[in-house]
């Protein structure tokens, strides 16, 4: 009778992460008597994957009933495959021995490769807000994909951006990879409603590319413009002075009226009106009693927007 051969018919197997890998192995003879073991890798550092005789291998099931006397099919299934399972798997026949079984013959090996989808891209912007005309950086990260080939694009409101740098790590061979990209975006006053999108395409994706988004409303600060105007003199010597606070974002704003440098009133923006571009307008008014003043009055509208240093606009009220 011919000497037993261990046949692993598949040189290579490709499996999607999360699926089950079937590693096929058959023996050509029932002799010699002894168990089969599966290993990942070869040599002294090889990793035991399955032992027919003993041990607990929760992810591994056998294709055939190995307890049957005439069984020569030693194929196994490994469940819930991850990229970390990639490697070459060997089906090894042992001869019954005392005290230990002795390795008799190994199959040629089956290389298991794993394809894994990239994680949903996460886009993060700068920690602090910035004003129009400034350039800000956005980062995009996606992890856990294999193979390494991946494309990443940046868009602002549907327009593709070109000023970005992308790295895929690690540079060498790995079971899975990560991508990290940084894009530079110049802010404009109209960007409150704008979105920055990072788009990742990979061979494993059956749908459109994965997208991560960042709203520029979380990044931009549009400082207000101020205009102080005096309304016609009303009855009882009262003058109505208004401070128009226009085109600001975000809404957080505090306004202080000063009469000749002295605080007259402080209020917080509440009933604002929203512009089409997402910025806000607000108006505050002050009634000034002209008869209480002998000299001209300097009225100042002072605005502190989003914790920034105050900006102000003054108006000289003529007392005639």
């Amino acid at each position: 009778e011919e000497e037993l051969q261990v046949i692993q018919p598949d040189k290579s197997v490709l499996v999607a992460a999360g699926e089950t890998a079937t590693l096929r192995c058959t023996a050509t003879s029932l002799i010699p008597v002894g168990p089969i073991q599966w290993f990942r890798g070869a040599g002294p550092g090889r990793e035991l994957i399955y032992n027919q005789k003993e041990g607990h291998f929760p992810r591994v099931t056998t294709v055939s009933d190995l307890t049957k006397r005439n069984n020569m099919d030693f194929s196994i299934r490994i469940g819930n495959i991850t990229p970390a399972d990639a490697g070459t798997y060997y089906c090894v026949k042992f001869r019954k021995g005392s005290p230990d079984d002795v390795e008799f013959k190994s199959g040629a090996g089956t290389e298991l490769s794993v394809r894994a989808k990239p994680s949903a891209p996460v886009v993060s912007g700068p920690a602090a807000r910035a004003t129009p005309q400034h350039t800000v950086s956005f980062t995009c990260e996606s992890h856990g994909f294999s193979p390494r080939d991946i494309t990443l694009k940046w868009f602002k409101n549907g327009n593709e951006l070109s000023d970005f740098q992308t790295n895929v790590d690690p540079v060498g061979e790995s079971v899975s990879y990560s991508i990290h990209s940084t894009a530079k975006v110049v802010l404009t006053r109209e960007d409150v409603h704008s979105q920055v999108i990072c788009e990742v395409a990979h061979v494993t994706l059956q749908g459109d590319p994965l997208r991560g988004t960042a709203n520029l409303s979380e990044t931009i600060r549009v400082p207000p413009t101020l205009e102080v105007t005096q309304q016609p003199v009303r009855a009882e010597n009262q003058v109505n002075v208004t401070c128009q606070v226009r085109k600001f974002y975000p809404q957080r704003l505090q306004l202080t009226w000063l009469e000749n440098g002295n605080v007259s009133r402080t209020e917080t923006a509440s009933t604002v009106t929203e512009n089409k571009d997402g910025t806000y307008n607000w108006m505050s008014w002050l009634l000034v009693n002209v008869s209480a003043h002998r000299d001209d009055v300097k009225l100042t509208c002072q605005v502190e927007h989003d914790g920034q240093p105050a900006v102000s606009k003054s108006h000289d009220l003529k007392v005639s």
């Epitope: 490709l14 499996v15 999607a16 494993t204 059956q206």
Partner: antibody
């Protein structure tokens, strides 16, 4: 799991024609699907794909001549204005479960003949 | 667009022969290459995907190798049912587009 094309016929130059691809055993919302064609005695030519979410992508030569769309059970190829060079067998196919780089399920094809 | 050049365009061989078909891409496609078999009046059938992986149900006499720009389909021992036309097909991960080789017709000698 299978796919099958229909709608192939004799058509006149300049007229529109719509081919359909009906799938069974799997959902169109889970896989990329593709259209291909093969002129008599010639090789295979890629036309375009539609993603699982319904976005179409076309070969560069298509130039708006064809439109790919889908419903829950069928994928369509609309040929806007037939030309004689469109005479071919048209195949639809599904990409493999491991990725979009290969097609593992093909229909038998449907013949389109363009002649006046 | 990527061009795929298949060679030879046709070959004559006998049952039992070892047959090799090559496919060259005009730029690197890494391992994104598939091989199909097509018989007259029939749809293509997938043989090999990702350059070297044998599709389920395909006899083990078919094998694929290569990466980058140069790829090979080998039939180790030609059988009567293997007489057909064979196509390579690439997928480019940047353009996300597909290209076929022009085909290789394997005929009986």
């Amino acid at each position: 799991q299978s796919v099958e094309e229909s709608g192939g016929r004799l058509g006149q130059p300049g007229t529109p024609l719509t081919l359909s691809c009906t799938v069974s055993g799997f959902s169109l919302s889970s896989y990329v699907m593709g259209w291909f064609r093969q002129a008599p005695g010639k090789g295979l030519e890629y036309i375009g794909i539609i993603s699982s979410s319904g976005s179409p992508y076309y070969a560069s030569w298509v130039n708006g001549r064809f439109t790919i769309s889908k419903t829950s059970t069928t994928m369509d190829l609309k040929m806007n204005s037939l030309r004689s060079e469109d005479t071919a067998t048209y195949f639809c196919a599904r990409v493999g479960p491991l990725g979009v780089d290969y097609f593992n399920i093909w229909g038998p094809g449907t013949l389109v003949t363009v002649s006046s | 667009d990527i061009q795929m050049t298949q060679s030879p365009s046709s070959l004559s061989a006998s049952v039992g022969d070892r047959v090799t078909i090559t496919c060259r891409a005009s730029q690197s496609i890494n391992s994104y290459l598939a091989w199909y078999q097509q018989k007259p009046g029939k749809a293509p059938k997938l043989l090999i995907y990702s350059a070297s992986f044998l599709y389920s149900g395909v006899p083990s006499r078919f094998s694929g190798s290569g990466s980058g720009t140069d790829f090979t389909l080998t039939i180790s021992s030609l059988q009567p049912e293997d007489f057909a036309t064979y196509y390579c097909q690439s997928w480019h991960y940047i353009s996300r587009s597909y290209t076929f080789g022009q085909g290789t017709k394997v005929e009986i000698k």
